[in-house]
């Protein structure tokens, strides 16, 4: 049916098809008829057609040249059908704040080219959406992106120079939103080779939850067409895309502080994302800053969180301490960072669910250590889990309801650290409540910011 | 809950063939890839075979390529393994594992059955 | 091709013991490395993916690190259920295993 002579060109033409059907059209092998070459289905006609559609050549049903030369152009290895979002109203990543890593650089480029491509890929996504990223250099991040050839560790080895020049996979865990790129081409900050910075605008919309776009003007087209990187804008449909996914620059409006600027400390209305003590000292965090309050001294210093902890995101939202461990463990979405000594460990960020927590638990509200029963907290929501810091698991008989068990606190808290050996301070919204856990009930109604002399 | 349901193991003599079939239910089996995995006795573990969401792509260890054929009837949430010309080292319990992934396959599996036996031996 | 070798290959330990189980990639898997648990006659269980994430439901006295072509998998202190086999994994290609004995 696609090709009625046998000729050897032809037969290879018909297996070189059938693959590229198979990879990116979904066409089942197994259940062609074992004489190839006299189709009586039309399983590959119709596949042939689906391509042709939606890449936008002329529909025929035919291995024609046109058709053929589509075949053999550089492209995406994600496949065009079964289109990548793959579940409904996912995957996306449920979080705006987002870290990649670069695990190895090309050596076809400087190492400034590649972070520098790599960056502006990334800022043409955050440009149009509330997304924030961040490149960290140690630790796990959310997008790993890696330069390899051939077999490299996922299922789909490369093919060698030219062919498929790179692969993504959606939001997730683990391999999910990394970004490979095929070592066999040659990487470029121009015309020549295969343009860094265009390849990987392509790839990081397949990290963030984009599937192919049939509009060849989009990025998100499964081909690779080089256009002048300085005058390079996203399509409407490329935008149109992404911004069903997260919404548009604007939704970060939504948070209190959308500037980022540093907040006023005595606004009556401050609230804090997290507190916990560390040491002799105390640390309040909201967005990017966190201040420093030493224990009985009025002074009060206002730092960044990333010019202590430069590899740390901003927004931390809950934090808590062991101090006999000089162990502070800061959280942001499903995500934790343990510091020692003031020092952030490597091989973090780890997942917050090897606490124990069940996989419905997305981020942690607040949490707090207390020393004589060896026991965490976290409040997640309008419950709370207990976890032996001993035994390393969660206790039995979590979560509990927040109202039932701490009288006059919920039904959710923002922060909340311990004091003094026998208090929790909870923080709700601009107010704190002084919790003597012995008595088990409220001792003092504070505003926020009480400790710094407002 | 996902639950991964093995069949169709049994004695077969070296040359002949057999149908593995795995009935998956407890997620939605369309969006997911699928793959084989075995296990000779008082052996380790060998991948054998594994399949995109769409069934569309498949891959195949070396021992078993030309000889298994791995499927799927999303349809009727059922994964297939034919294995024509057996030999005796393919005996072992037939494991069918659900990536984490299913446009692309992670190689991470999630969930596992319990395995079917396949005995080839005359 | 891809191979994974894991050591060592059988390991005699007590309950509260410290265990280490380690394996290694002839080229860099970056941290596409999975750990499971198996006991005999049951199939395997995922405990940790990507090197060092811990799958849900699974005790935090299992950890695992590394990335590149060198990782271990860590139990901190042996419980009596924690007597198996454990495999590493990387896509297709599984560790020989290593078996967890009782001393």
């Known amino acids: 049916l696609p090709l009625n002579s046998s000729t050897s060109l032809e037969k290879n033409n018909v297996l070189f098809g059938e693959r590229y059907l198979e990879k990116f059209y979904g066409l089942e092998i197994n259940k062609l008829p074992v004489t190839k070459m006299k189709y009586s289905g039309n399983l590959m006609k119709e596949k042939i057609q689906e391509m042709q559609h939606f890449l936008g050549l002329k529909v025929t049903g035919q291995l024609d040249t046109s058709t053929l030369e589509m075949m053999h152009a550089p492209r995406c290895g994600v496949p065009d059908v079964h289109h990548f979002r793959e579940m409904p109203g996912g995957p996306v990543w449920r979080k705006h704040y987002i870290t990649y890593r670069i695990n190895n650089y090309t050596p076809d480029m400087n190492r400034e080219d590649v972070d520098y491509a790599i960056r502006k890929a990334f800022q043409v996504w955050s440009n149009v959406t509330p997304l924030k990223f961040s490149k960290i250099n140690t630790g796990m991040a959310d997008i790993l992106v890696v330069f390899a050839r051939g077999a490299h560790g996922d299922f789909h080895a490369f093919d060698g120079k030219g062919g498929i020049l790179a692969h993504a996979f959606g939001p997730g865990s683990g391999i999910g939103g990394d970004a490979h790129f095929d070592e066999d081409e040659f990487w470029t900050t121009h015309s020549g080779g295969t343009n860094l910075f265009l390849t990987a605008v392509h790839e990081i919309g397949h990290s963030l939850g984009l599937g192919h776009s049939s509009d060849p003007k989009a990025v998100m087209f499964p081909t690779y067409k080089y256009v002048d990187i300085n005058t390079f804008r996203l399509s409407a449909d490329d935008i149109r895309g992404i911004q069903s996914l997260y919404g548009d620059p604007k939704e970060n409006q939504r948070l209190p502080n959308p500037d980022n600027s540093e907040p006023a400390l005595c606004d009556p209305n401050l609230s804090f994302d997290a507190v916990t003590t560390v040491g002799n000292k105390i640390f309040f965090f909201k967005d990017r800053f966190f201040w420093l309050k030493v224990s009985e001294r009025p002074k009060t210093s206002v730092n960044l969180i990333s010019s202590l902890w430069p590899t740390l995101p901003s927004g931390i939202e809950a934090a808590y301490e062991i101090e006999a461990r000089n162990q502070v463990f800061l959280f942001k979405d499903d995500k934790y960072w343990l510091i020692s000594n003031l020092r952030p460990e490597p091989n973090y960020p780890k997942s917050i669910h090897s606490f124990g927590f069940p996989n419905f638990v997305k981020k942690i509200d607040a949490a707090v250590f207390n020393p004589r029963f060896y026991r965490t907290y976290f409040f997640v929501d309008n419950q709370y889990w207990r976890y032996d810091e001993r035994r390393q698991m969660m206790d039995p008989g979590y979560p509990k309801l927040i109202t039932k068990n701490f009288q006059g606190i919920g039904p959710k808290i923002d922060a909340v650290f311990y004091s003094k050996n026998k208090y929790y301070y909870f923080f709700q919204g601009s107010n704190q409540f002084e919790y003597d856990f012995l008595l088990q009930r409220i001792t003092k109604t504070l505003k926020s910011n009480s400790w710094f002399g407002c | 809950e996902v639950q991964l349901l093995e069949s169709g193991g049994g004695l077969v003599q070296p040359g002949g063939s057999l149908r593995l079939s795995c009935a998956a239910s407890?997620?939605?089996?369309?969006?997911?890839?699928m793959h084989w995995v075995r296990q000779a006795p008082g052996k380790g573990l060998e991948w054998v075979s594994g399949?995109?969401?769409?069934?569309?792509?498949?891959f195949y260890a070396d021992s078993v390529k030309g000889r298994f054929t791995i499927s799927r009837d999303n349809s009727k949430n059922t994964l297939y393994l034919q294995m024509n010309s057996l030999r005796a080292e393919d005996t072992a319990v037939y494991y069918c594992?659900?990536?984490?992934?299913?446009?692309?396959?992670?190689?991470?599996?999630?969930?596992w059955g319990r395995g079917t036996l396949v005995t080839v031996s005359s | 091709d891809i191979q994974m070798t894991q050591s060592p290959s059988s390991l005699s330990a007590s309950v509260g013991d410290r265990v280490t189980i380690t394996c290694r990639a002839n080229?860099?898997?970056?941290?596409?490395l999975n750990w499971y648990q198996q006991k005999p006659g049951k199939a395997p269980k995922l405990l940790i993916y990507a090197a060092s994430s811990l799958q849900s439901g699974v005790p935090s006295r299992f950890s695992g690190s590394g990335s590149g072509t060198d990782f271990t998998l860590t139990i901190s202190s042996l419980q009596p259920e924690d007597f198996a086999t454990y495999y590493c994994?990387?896509?297709?290609?599984f560790g020989q295993g290593t078996k967890l004995e009782i001393k």
């Open positions: 080229q860099s898997i970056y941290t596409y």
């Open positions: 594992a659900k990536d984490i992934r299913g446009v692309f396959l992670s190689g991470l599996f999630d969930h």
């Open positions: 407890g997620f939605t089996f369309s969006w997911y890839g």
């Open positions: 994994q990387q896509a297709g290609i």
């Open positions: 399949i995109v969401s769409s069934g569309g792509e498949t």
